[in-house]
Protein backbone atom coordinates (compact mmCIF):
# COMPACT_ATOMS: atom_id res chain seq x y z
CA UNK A 1 0.00 0.00 0.00
CA UNK A 2 0.92 3.68 -0.04
CA UNK A 3 0.66 4.18 3.75
CA UNK A 4 3.77 5.58 5.41
CA UNK A 5 5.50 3.31 7.91
CA UNK A 6 8.47 5.59 8.51
CA UNK A 7 9.06 9.32 8.31
CA UNK A 8 10.42 11.07 5.20
CA UNK A 9 13.99 12.32 5.15
CA UNK A 10 14.44 15.47 7.27
CA UNK A 11 11.25 14.78 9.26
CA UNK A 12 11.30 13.88 12.96
CA UNK A 13 9.34 10.92 14.30
CA UNK A 14 7.55 11.26 17.63
CA UNK A 15 4.72 9.18 19.06
CA UNK A 16 3.68 7.72 15.70
CA UNK A 17 3.66 11.08 13.95
CA UNK A 18 6.20 12.76 11.70
CA UNK A 19 7.06 16.43 12.09
CA UNK A 20 8.84 18.86 9.79
CA UNK A 21 10.10 22.17 11.17
CA UNK A 22 10.56 25.07 8.79
CA UNK A 23 13.50 27.42 9.13
CA UNK A 24 11.93 30.25 7.15
CA UNK A 25 8.57 31.98 7.17
CA UNK A 26 5.32 32.01 5.22
CA UNK A 27 1.80 33.31 5.64
CA UNK A 28 -0.49 30.81 7.38
CA UNK A 29 -2.37 29.78 4.21
CA UNK A 30 0.88 29.27 2.28
CA UNK A 31 2.30 27.19 5.11
CA UNK A 32 -0.92 25.16 5.17
CA UNK A 33 -0.65 24.51 1.42
CA UNK A 34 3.00 23.53 1.76
CA UNK A 35 2.07 20.88 4.31
CA UNK A 36 -0.88 19.62 2.27
CA UNK A 37 1.22 19.05 -0.85
CA UNK A 38 3.46 16.96 1.39
CA UNK A 39 0.42 14.90 2.51
CA UNK A 40 0.62 16.55 5.91
CA UNK A 41 -1.09 19.33 7.83
CA UNK A 42 -0.03 22.18 10.07
CA UNK A 43 0.70 20.74 13.50
CA UNK A 44 -2.26 19.88 15.70
CA UNK A 45 -1.38 19.92 19.38
CA UNK A 46 -3.42 17.40 21.34
CA UNK A 47 -1.50 17.11 24.62
CA UNK A 48 0.94 18.84 26.94
CA UNK A 49 3.52 16.21 25.97
CA UNK A 50 3.17 17.09 22.28
CA UNK A 51 3.30 20.80 23.15
CA UNK A 52 6.64 20.30 24.92
CA UNK A 53 8.02 18.24 22.02
CA UNK A 54 7.16 20.90 19.44
CA UNK A 55 8.32 23.72 21.71
CA UNK A 56 11.68 21.99 22.15
CA UNK A 57 12.21 21.84 18.37
CA UNK A 58 11.06 25.32 17.40
CA UNK A 59 12.74 27.30 20.16
CA UNK A 60 11.65 30.85 21.07
CA UNK A 61 10.36 31.73 17.60
CA UNK A 62 6.84 32.62 16.42
CA UNK A 63 5.61 29.52 14.59
CA UNK A 64 2.26 28.72 12.94
CA UNK A 65 0.14 25.77 14.04
CA UNK A 66 -2.95 24.23 12.44
CA UNK A 67 -5.51 26.24 14.39
CA UNK A 68 -7.60 29.11 13.02
CA UNK A 69 -10.95 30.85 13.30
CA UNK A 70 -11.17 32.30 9.80
CA UNK A 71 -14.73 30.99 9.42
CA UNK A 72 -16.01 31.85 12.90
CA UNK A 73 -15.24 29.30 15.60
CA UNK A 74 -11.73 28.05 16.33
CA UNK A 75 -10.96 24.89 14.38
CA UNK A 76 -8.06 22.48 14.08
CA UNK A 77 -7.18 21.71 10.46
CA UNK A 78 -7.51 17.94 10.93
CA UNK A 79 -10.95 18.13 12.54
CA UNK A 80 -9.79 17.58 16.12
CA UNK A 81 -12.40 19.09 18.42
CA UNK A 82 -11.24 22.46 19.70
CA UNK A 83 -13.64 22.90 22.59
CA UNK A 84 -12.74 19.67 24.36
CA UNK A 85 -9.12 19.55 23.27
CA UNK A 86 -5.80 20.74 24.64
CA UNK A 87 -5.22 24.51 24.79
CA UNK A 88 -2.21 26.58 25.79
CA UNK A 89 -3.13 30.22 25.14
CA UNK A 90 -1.23 33.11 26.65
CA UNK A 91 -3.23 35.04 29.26
CA UNK A 92 -6.00 37.12 27.67
CA UNK A 93 -5.54 35.35 24.34
CA UNK A 94 -7.03 34.86 21.84
CA UNK A 95 -8.17 38.47 21.60
CA UNK A 96 -8.84 39.00 17.86
CA UNK A 97 -6.95 42.29 18.14
CA UNK A 98 -7.77 44.91 15.50
CA UNK A 99 -5.19 47.48 16.60
CA UNK A 100 -2.39 46.25 14.35
CA UNK A 101 -3.59 48.44 11.48
CA UNK A 102 -3.35 45.67 8.88
CA UNK A 103 -7.09 45.30 8.43
CA UNK A 104 -9.33 42.76 10.14
CA UNK A 105 -8.59 40.94 13.35
CA UNK A 106 -6.41 37.95 14.19
CA UNK A 107 -7.56 34.57 12.91
CA UNK A 108 -4.55 32.24 13.02
CA UNK A 109 -2.80 30.71 16.02
CA UNK A 110 0.93 30.49 16.57
CA UNK A 111 3.42 29.44 19.21
CA UNK A 112 5.02 32.50 20.81
CA UNK A 113 8.55 32.81 22.13
CA UNK A 114 7.61 31.03 25.36
CA UNK A 115 5.61 28.32 23.60
CA UNK A 116 2.21 29.56 24.67
CA UNK A 117 -0.28 30.42 21.96
CA UNK A 118 -1.42 33.73 20.50
CA UNK A 119 -3.76 34.65 17.69
CA UNK A 120 -2.27 36.86 14.99
CA UNK A 121 -2.75 38.23 11.48
CA UNK A 122 -2.68 35.23 9.13
CA UNK A 123 -0.53 37.07 6.57
CA UNK A 124 2.46 37.37 8.88
CA UNK A 125 5.40 35.32 7.56
CA UNK A 126 6.07 33.01 10.50
CA UNK A 127 7.83 29.68 10.58
CA UNK A 128 5.59 26.62 10.62
CA UNK A 129 5.43 22.94 11.55
CA UNK A 130 3.95 20.19 9.38
CA UNK A 131 2.67 16.97 10.90
CA UNK A 132 1.57 13.69 9.36
CA UNK A 133 0.44 10.56 11.14
CA UNK A 134 2.20 7.30 10.45
CA UNK A 135 0.17 4.38 9.10
CA UNK A 136 -2.37 3.50 11.78
CA UNK A 137 -2.41 -0.15 10.70
CA UNK A 138 1.30 -0.49 11.33
CA UNK A 139 0.67 0.00 15.06
CA UNK A 140 -1.15 -3.34 15.24
CA UNK A 141 0.88 -6.44 16.07
CA UNK A 142 1.72 -8.75 13.17
CA UNK A 143 -0.42 -11.81 12.60
CA UNK A 144 1.34 -14.98 13.75
Amino acid sequence: GSERTCCPVNWVEHERSCYWFSRSGKAWADADNYCRLEDAHLVVVTSWEEQKFVQHHIGPVNTWMGLHDQNGPWKWVDGTDYETGFKNWRPEQPDDWYGHGLGGGEDCAHFTDDGRWNDDVCQRPYRWVCETELDKASQEPPLL
Epitope: S2, R4, P8, K26, D30, R36, L37, E38, D39, P125
Partner: antibody, heavy 121, light 107 residues
Protein backbone atom coordinates in the same frame (compact mmCIF):
# COMPACT_ATOMS: atom_id res chain seq x y z
CA UNK B 1 17.50 7.16 -13.21
CA UNK B 2 14.41 9.28 -12.59
CA UNK B 3 12.20 9.44 -15.67
CA UNK B 4 8.74 10.64 -16.66
CA UNK B 5 7.14 9.71 -19.95
CA UNK B 6 4.10 11.69 -21.05
CA UNK B 7 1.49 10.50 -23.54
CA UNK B 8 -2.02 11.37 -24.68
CA UNK B 9 -1.29 14.63 -26.44
CA UNK B 10 -2.51 15.41 -29.90
CA UNK B 11 -5.30 17.28 -31.60
CA UNK B 12 -8.32 18.26 -29.52
CA UNK B 13 -11.49 20.07 -30.44
CA UNK B 14 -12.53 23.34 -28.87
CA UNK B 15 -14.99 22.42 -26.12
CA UNK B 16 -13.77 18.83 -26.18
CA UNK B 17 -11.67 16.68 -23.86
CA UNK B 18 -8.27 15.00 -23.70
CA UNK B 19 -6.55 12.93 -21.05
CA UNK B 20 -2.79 13.11 -20.61
CA UNK B 21 -0.84 10.36 -18.86
CA UNK B 22 2.63 10.32 -17.33
CA UNK B 23 4.37 7.11 -16.34
CA UNK B 24 7.15 7.57 -13.82
CA UNK B 25 10.11 5.41 -12.87
CA UNK B 26 13.33 5.55 -10.91
CA UNK B 27 11.92 6.97 -7.66
CA UNK B 28 9.30 6.27 -5.00
CA UNK B 29 6.27 7.55 -6.86
CA UNK B 30 3.77 6.88 -4.07
CA UNK B 31 5.32 9.47 -1.75
CA UNK B 32 6.25 12.06 -4.37
CA UNK B 33 4.19 15.13 -5.15
CA UNK B 34 3.80 15.64 -8.91
CA UNK B 35 2.85 18.54 -11.13
CA UNK B 36 1.88 19.56 -14.65
CA UNK B 37 3.50 22.62 -16.25
CA UNK B 38 2.67 23.82 -19.75
CA UNK B 39 4.30 25.99 -22.37
CA UNK B 40 2.37 27.55 -25.24
CA UNK B 41 4.28 27.67 -28.56
CA UNK B 42 6.99 30.34 -28.36
CA UNK B 43 5.88 31.38 -24.87
CA UNK B 44 6.99 30.96 -21.29
CA UNK B 45 6.22 28.38 -18.64
CA UNK B 46 2.88 28.18 -16.82
CA UNK B 47 2.20 25.99 -13.80
CA UNK B 48 -1.07 24.08 -14.25
CA UNK B 49 -1.65 21.76 -11.30
CA UNK B 50 -0.07 19.76 -8.50
CA UNK B 51 -1.04 16.68 -6.53
CA UNK B 52 0.30 15.20 -3.30
CA UNK B 53 1.81 11.73 -3.19
CA UNK B 54 -1.35 10.06 -1.92
CA UNK B 55 -3.54 11.99 -4.34
CA UNK B 56 -5.56 13.44 -1.45
CA UNK B 57 -4.55 17.06 -2.05
CA UNK B 58 -4.71 18.89 -5.36
CA UNK B 59 -3.94 22.43 -6.50
CA UNK B 60 -4.80 24.26 -9.74
CA UNK B 61 -4.04 27.44 -11.62
CA UNK B 62 -7.07 29.72 -11.95
CA UNK B 63 -6.90 29.37 -15.74
CA UNK B 64 -7.77 25.65 -15.57
CA UNK B 65 -9.75 25.38 -12.33
CA UNK B 66 -13.05 23.63 -12.90
CA UNK B 67 -11.97 22.33 -16.31
CA UNK B 68 -8.87 20.23 -15.58
CA UNK B 69 -8.53 17.44 -13.03
CA UNK B 70 -5.25 15.96 -11.87
CA UNK B 71 -5.29 12.40 -10.51
CA UNK B 72 -2.84 9.57 -10.01
CA UNK B 73 -2.82 5.78 -9.88
CA UNK B 74 -0.02 4.83 -7.52
CA UNK B 75 -0.37 1.14 -8.34
CA UNK B 76 0.64 2.01 -11.91
CA UNK B 77 3.11 4.82 -11.12
CA UNK B 78 1.01 7.01 -13.39
CA UNK B 79 -0.10 10.64 -13.23
CA UNK B 80 -3.08 11.91 -15.23
CA UNK B 81 -4.46 15.23 -16.40
CA UNK B 82 -8.08 15.17 -17.52
CA UNK B 83 -8.66 18.24 -19.68
CA UNK B 84 -12.26 19.27 -20.38
CA UNK B 85 -13.85 22.28 -22.08
CA UNK B 86 -10.70 22.84 -24.10
CA UNK B 87 -10.00 26.22 -25.68
CA UNK B 88 -7.33 27.46 -28.09
CA UNK B 89 -5.50 28.93 -25.07
CA UNK B 90 -4.84 25.39 -23.84
CA UNK B 91 -2.62 24.68 -26.86
CA UNK B 92 0.80 23.95 -25.38
CA UNK B 93 3.44 21.39 -24.60
CA UNK B 94 2.46 19.78 -21.29
CA UNK B 95 5.28 18.66 -19.01
CA UNK B 96 4.97 16.12 -16.23
CA UNK B 97 7.27 17.12 -13.39
CA UNK B 98 8.39 15.67 -10.09
CA UNK B 99 7.98 18.15 -7.26
CA UNK B 100 10.79 18.46 -4.75
CA UNK B 101 10.30 20.08 -1.37
CA UNK B 102 13.43 21.92 -0.26
CA UNK B 103 13.91 24.64 2.36
CA UNK B 104 10.18 25.30 2.58
CA UNK B 105 9.61 25.68 -1.16
CA UNK B 106 8.29 23.43 -3.91
CA UNK B 107 10.45 23.20 -7.02
CA UNK B 108 10.35 21.13 -10.22
CA UNK B 109 12.96 18.46 -10.94
CA UNK B 110 13.23 16.55 -13.15
CA UNK B 111 10.93 17.22 -16.10
CA UNK B 112 9.44 14.83 -18.64
CA UNK B 113 10.03 15.42 -22.34
CA UNK B 114 6.55 16.92 -22.78
CA UNK B 115 3.55 16.11 -24.93
CA UNK B 116 2.01 18.59 -27.36
CA UNK B 117 -1.69 19.41 -27.14
CA UNK B 118 -3.18 21.36 -30.03
CA UNK B 119 -6.75 22.64 -29.71
CA UNK B 120 -8.47 23.52 -32.96
CA UNK B 121 -11.61 25.60 -33.26
CA UNK C 1 -1.08 35.97 -7.42
CA UNK C 2 2.62 36.78 -7.31
CA UNK C 3 3.96 38.21 -10.56
CA UNK C 4 7.55 37.46 -11.52
CA UNK C 5 9.29 39.93 -13.83
CA UNK C 6 12.56 39.03 -15.50
CA UNK C 7 15.00 41.41 -17.13
CA UNK C 8 16.31 41.71 -19.66
CA UNK C 9 14.08 39.63 -21.95
CA UNK C 10 17.16 38.87 -24.03
CA UNK C 11 20.87 39.38 -23.63
CA UNK C 12 23.62 39.12 -26.24
CA UNK C 13 26.93 37.81 -24.95
CA UNK C 14 30.12 36.04 -25.96
CA UNK C 15 31.82 32.94 -24.62
CA UNK C 16 33.70 33.88 -21.47
CA UNK C 17 31.43 36.80 -20.61
CA UNK C 18 29.88 37.28 -17.21
CA UNK C 19 26.10 37.30 -17.59
CA UNK C 20 23.61 38.55 -15.01
CA UNK C 21 19.85 38.02 -15.17
CA UNK C 22 17.45 39.56 -12.68
CA UNK C 23 14.05 38.49 -11.43
CA UNK C 24 11.70 40.66 -9.39
CA UNK C 25 8.69 39.41 -7.42
CA UNK C 26 5.58 41.56 -7.01
CA UNK C 27 5.71 40.85 -3.27
CA UNK C 28 8.24 39.42 -0.86
CA UNK C 29 8.95 35.71 -1.32
CA UNK C 30 11.83 35.29 1.14
CA UNK C 31 14.24 32.87 -0.57
CA UNK C 32 11.57 30.71 -2.22
CA UNK C 33 12.95 31.05 -5.72
CA UNK C 34 14.35 28.74 -8.39
CA UNK C 35 16.10 29.20 -11.72
CA UNK C 36 15.67 26.89 -14.74
CA UNK C 37 17.51 26.57 -18.04
CA UNK C 38 15.70 25.56 -21.22
CA UNK C 39 17.27 24.80 -24.57
CA UNK C 40 15.22 24.81 -27.82
CA UNK C 41 13.02 21.74 -28.14
CA UNK C 42 14.02 20.45 -24.71
CA UNK C 43 12.44 20.36 -21.27
CA UNK C 44 13.57 22.86 -18.64
CA UNK C 45 16.27 21.87 -16.16
CA UNK C 46 16.56 23.02 -12.54
CA UNK C 47 19.74 25.01 -11.90
CA UNK C 48 19.24 26.83 -8.59
CA UNK C 49 16.72 26.38 -5.80
CA UNK C 50 16.09 28.30 -2.58
CA UNK C 51 17.55 31.39 -4.30
CA UNK C 52 21.19 30.34 -4.02
CA UNK C 53 21.52 26.55 -3.72
CA UNK C 54 23.11 24.84 -6.71
CA UNK C 55 21.29 21.74 -7.90
CA UNK C 56 23.39 18.57 -8.05
CA UNK C 57 25.34 18.26 -11.29
CA UNK C 58 25.04 21.93 -12.25
CA UNK C 59 28.39 23.64 -13.02
CA UNK C 60 29.68 26.04 -10.38
CA UNK C 61 29.81 28.91 -12.88
CA UNK C 62 26.07 29.28 -12.17
CA UNK C 63 25.16 31.10 -8.97
CA UNK C 64 22.06 32.69 -7.51
CA UNK C 65 21.54 35.42 -4.97
CA UNK C 66 18.87 37.63 -3.48
CA UNK C 67 15.92 37.46 -1.10
CA UNK C 68 12.64 39.25 -0.63
CA UNK C 69 11.73 40.68 -4.02
CA UNK C 70 14.98 40.94 -5.98
CA UNK C 71 16.98 37.99 -7.26
CA UNK C 72 19.91 37.44 -9.58
CA UNK C 73 21.23 34.54 -11.65
CA UNK C 74 24.87 34.92 -12.62
CA UNK C 75 26.89 32.91 -15.12
CA UNK C 76 30.48 33.75 -14.25
CA UNK C 77 32.05 32.68 -17.55
CA UNK C 78 29.61 31.89 -20.34
CA UNK C 79 30.19 28.59 -22.11
CA UNK C 80 28.86 27.55 -25.55
CA UNK C 81 26.33 25.19 -23.94
CA UNK C 82 24.88 28.01 -21.82
CA UNK C 83 23.13 29.74 -24.71
CA UNK C 84 19.52 29.07 -23.72
CA UNK C 85 16.46 30.62 -22.11
CA UNK C 86 16.39 31.04 -18.33
CA UNK C 87 13.29 31.20 -16.14
CA UNK C 88 12.77 32.09 -12.50
CA UNK C 89 9.97 30.53 -10.42
CA UNK C 90 8.55 31.58 -7.07
CA UNK C 91 7.72 28.84 -4.57
CA UNK C 92 6.29 31.03 -1.83
CA UNK C 93 2.62 30.49 -2.58
CA UNK C 94 0.08 28.96 -4.95
CA UNK C 95 -0.33 29.51 -7.78
CA UNK C 96 3.35 28.81 -8.41
CA UNK C 97 4.45 31.33 -11.04
CA UNK C 98 7.32 31.77 -13.48
CA UNK C 99 9.04 34.78 -14.92
CA UNK C 100 8.68 35.49 -18.62
CA UNK C 101 12.14 34.19 -19.44
CA UNK C 102 15.48 35.63 -20.50
CA UNK C 103 17.08 34.41 -23.70
CA UNK C 104 20.87 34.37 -23.70
CA UNK C 105 22.02 34.70 -27.32
CA UNK C 106 25.34 34.77 -29.12
CA UNK C 107 26.67 38.27 -29.72
Amino acid sequence: EVQMLESGGGLGQSGGSLRLSCTASGFTFTTSAMSWVRQAPGKGLEWVSAISGSGANTFYADSVKGRFTVTRDNSKNTLYLQMNSLTAEDTAVYYCVKVIAVAGGHFFDPWGQGTLVTVSS
Amino acid sequence: DIQMTQSPSSVYASVGDRVTITCRASQGISSYLAWYQQKPGKAPKLLIYAASSLQSGVPSRFSGSGSGTDFTLTISSLQPEDFATYYCQQANSFPLTFGGGTKVEIK
